[in-house]
Structure formats: structure tokens, C-alpha cells
């Protein structure tokens, strides 16, 4: 006999990285017929939704109008059909950005390199932080962590045309509070013609949307819950 229901999906719209004082919606998708959803924050019950009519609804949304460091952290949700509860969702790490200062991102030997060259990014922030994050813009939101007193280095190793794209970095004051983003650095990797044609660039965010980390449905990421969860979890573990 089944003791629990399948876990729901949890994600944030427009993104799990939320500039302070901006809005975000936490979405929890369970099953049609669920009579109650519970959103938990840092292990404690945060909010409850009892959708009506339950047989016509399989997703609820919890709106945060004004993101701040108190609202940043780990969220999960569960749902109930009759008296049977689901497994908890994966953890959603909600991050507040645009805190305090702006780091500087540089790249060595330079932003234009040849395939096979070793490339290292340097992220520098003079205020009190020891963790840095390097993000490559694009659908899969590649993220690397680095550590250092005022600067972290991110060696990419010998690069290929797949490394082409726009990078930014953040200083992290804790797992869920990040600095303003650095100015973008566009890495151009030239290779032979054949390699270039076989390695299309990730679709990047339009410049204006990256400014507020708005992932629109055009990127496809919101629709791909598994990828969304995977990206968010790997980022902060």
C-alpha cells in the first residue's frame, strides 16, 4: 500500500536569483485533486494553500513582493490528497542579490583566445566575503564556485568553442546573499571552422533581462522543472 504521494516540483519565477526589493513567485506543482499545499522555509511551515476546486488545480503560487535577506534560504513544498501526504519536493535555494558591492571580473590571458589555450577568470571584491560565483549566461546557467580573501580564480583549463559566451561573477556573503553582479566579460574562443559550426553557443539572456536576472519562458528553463531544480541545487551545494 502506498504511504506517500510523488514529490511535487518546486521552482521560482522568474528566477531563483532575486535582486533585493524585487518580486518573486515560488511555484509548487503537485497533482490534480490535491486539497492542501504547504510551503516550508528553512524547515518550518511558511504558508498554506487549499486550492478550490482541487480537481482543476495542480499548481499553487506563493508571491514574495519584496525580496530581502530574511526571505532568502531553502524552500520546499508538500501536498495532500485526502489524508495522504506527498514526499517533500527538492529544496529550492532562493538567493537575494544586489547586496552591498559590485565585484570586478577579469580574464587572463584576455577575452579573445584560441581553442586549446588555458583561460582563467578572476573575480575580485574588496569587502568581507570569501566565496565567489562565476556564472556563464545561458539556458543552463553554468555556475562555478571559488574561494579567496578578496579574489578568487576560476581556471577553465584549455578552452573550446563551447566556452564562448558572456560571464559574470558575484561575491557571496552567505549561501543565499550575493553581491551585485560584475560587469559582463564576453569570452571569444576561435577554433577551426568545423569545430565552430559544431559547437553552437548557449542561448544567452537579452542584456536588459540579465540585469534583473529575469528568465522568460523563451529560455525554456521555467518549463523544464528538472533542469531548474538541478541548476538551483548544484549551485548551492
Amino acid at each position: 500500500q502506498q504511504q506517500t504521494l510523488p514529490k511535487p516540483f518546486i521552482w521560482a519565477e522568474p528566477h531563483f536569483m532575486v535582486p533585493k526589493e524585487k518580486q518573486v513567485t515560488i511555484c509548487c506543482q503537485g497533482n490534480y485533486g490535491a486539497v492542501e499545499y504547504q510551503l516550508h522555509f528553512e524547515g518550518s511551515l511558511f504558508a498554506v494553500d487549499r486550492p478550490k476546486p482541487p480537481e482543476r488545480i495542480n499548481k499553487v503560487q506563493f508571491y514574495i513582493p519584496d525580496m530581502n535577506s530574511r526571505m532568502a534560504g531553502q524552500y520546499s513544498c508538500i501536498y495532500r490528497v485526502g489524508e495522504l501526504w506527498s514526499e517533500p519536493s527538492n529544496l529550492l535555494d532562493l538567493v537575494v542579490t544586489e547586496m552591498y558591492d559590485t565585484p570586478t571580473l577579469s580574464v587572463h590571458p584576455g577575452p579573445e583566445v584560441i581553442s586549446g589555450e588555458k583561460v582563467t577568470f578572476y573575480c575580485r571584491l574588496d569587502t568581507a566575503t570569501s566565496m565567489f560565483l562565476l556564472l556563464k549566461e545561458g539556458r543552463s546557467s553554468h555556475v562555478q564556485r571559488g574561494y579567496g580573501k578578496v579574489q578568487a580564480e576560476f581556471p577553465l583549463g584549455p578552452v573550446t568553442t563551447a566556452h564562448r559566451g558572456t560571464y559574470r561573477c558575484f561575491g557571496s556573503y552567505n549561501n543565499h546573499a550575493w553581491s551585485f553582479p560584475s560587469e559582463p566579460v564576453k569570452l571569444l574562443v576561435t577554433g577551426d571552422i568545423e569545430n565552430t559550426s559544431l559547437a553552437p553557443e548557449d542561448p544567452t539572456f537579452p542584456a536588459d533581462t540579465w540585469g534583473t536576472y529575469l528568465l522568460t519562458t523563451e529560455t525554456g528553463l521555467q518549463k523544464d522543472h528538472a533542469l531548474w531544480d538541478h541548476t538551483a541545487q548544484n549551485l548551492l551545494r
Epitope: L45, A47, V48, K52, Y63
Partner: nanobody, 127 residues
Framework: QVQLVESGGGLVQAGDSLRLSCVAS????????MGWFRQAPGKEREFVAA????????YYADSVKGRFTISRDNAKNTVYLQMNSLKPEDTAVYYC????????????????????WGQGTQVTVSS
């Protein structure tokens, strides 16, 4: 912006009943989810009960379930907390809270969920 004013507190004996009221200013009361919290001396403020905008959803802390009832009258801009079978451990300052961003079927349980708070009304239950 909404202002919340609680009333109805007082000193009662264990086993007695009290009804707390919270009146909200403004014409948009029906768009707010409402909650009651309480804070005993030297303790954290804790969730008691909450009610959604249209009263479709109510939710209670385990410690008051079956004894307390939350209700609202949108025409009177008022939310109520009917407290029966009071116990000495119910002694606390009771606060009313409002959130303007909930859906019709949603309530908040965490303090950080709520935007607006009243000043509180004291409830003392003697044994």
C-alpha cells in the same frame, strides 16, 4: 497601507472564553489574508491562526486546534478570534497581522509572511 487595532483582551479564569477582534482601516480589507499571533513574556512570537481573503481557508496551530476559531466579516473590516477553554499557557499578547499578496485560498503561517501588524491586546488566563 492598512492599520490594525486589536481589542477584546482581558483577564479570565482557566476554562473561560474570550473573543478578540481586529479592525482594519481602509476599503480593501477583503483583499488581505489575516492572521493571529501571540507572544508570551520571554518567548518568540508564535503563530495562532490564519484565514484567507474570502474565508475559504483557515489554519490553526496545533496548540489551539479545536479550542480557537478564526473568522472574518469583510463588511465590517474585522477579523475575530474566538477563544474557548482557555488555559494558563494561552497567556500572551495577541497580535493581528495582514498580508495583501495572498491568493483567495492561501494563508501565511510564518511571521515574515505578513506585511502589517497591530499593537496587540493582552490576554491573561489565571488558574
Amino acid at each position: 497601507q492598512v492599520q490594525l487595532v486589536e481589542s477584546g483582551g482581558g483577564l479570565v479564569q482557566a476554562g473561560d472564553s474570550l473573543r478578540l477582534s481586529c479592525v482594519a482601516s481602509g476599503r480593501t480589507f477583503s483583499t488581505y489574508a489575516m492572521g493571529w499571533f501571540r507572544q508570551a513574556p520571554g518567548k518568540e512570537r508564535e503563530f495562532v491562526a490564519a484565514i484567507s481573503r474570502n474565508a475559504d481557508t483557515t489554519y490553526y496551530a496545533d496548540s489551539v486546534k479545536g479550542r480557537f476559531t478564526i473568522s472574518r466579516d469583510n463588511a465590517k473590516n474585522t477579523v475575530y478570534l474566538q477563544m474557548n477553554s482557555l488555559k494558563p499557557e494561552d497567556t500572551a499578547v495577541y497580535y493581528c497581522a495582514a498580508d495583501r499578496y495572498s491568493s483567495n485560498t492561501q494563508v501565511g503561517v510564518a511571521r515574515t509572511y505578513y506585511d502589517y501588524w497591530g499593537q496587540g491586546t493582552q490576554v491573561t488566563v489565571s488558574s
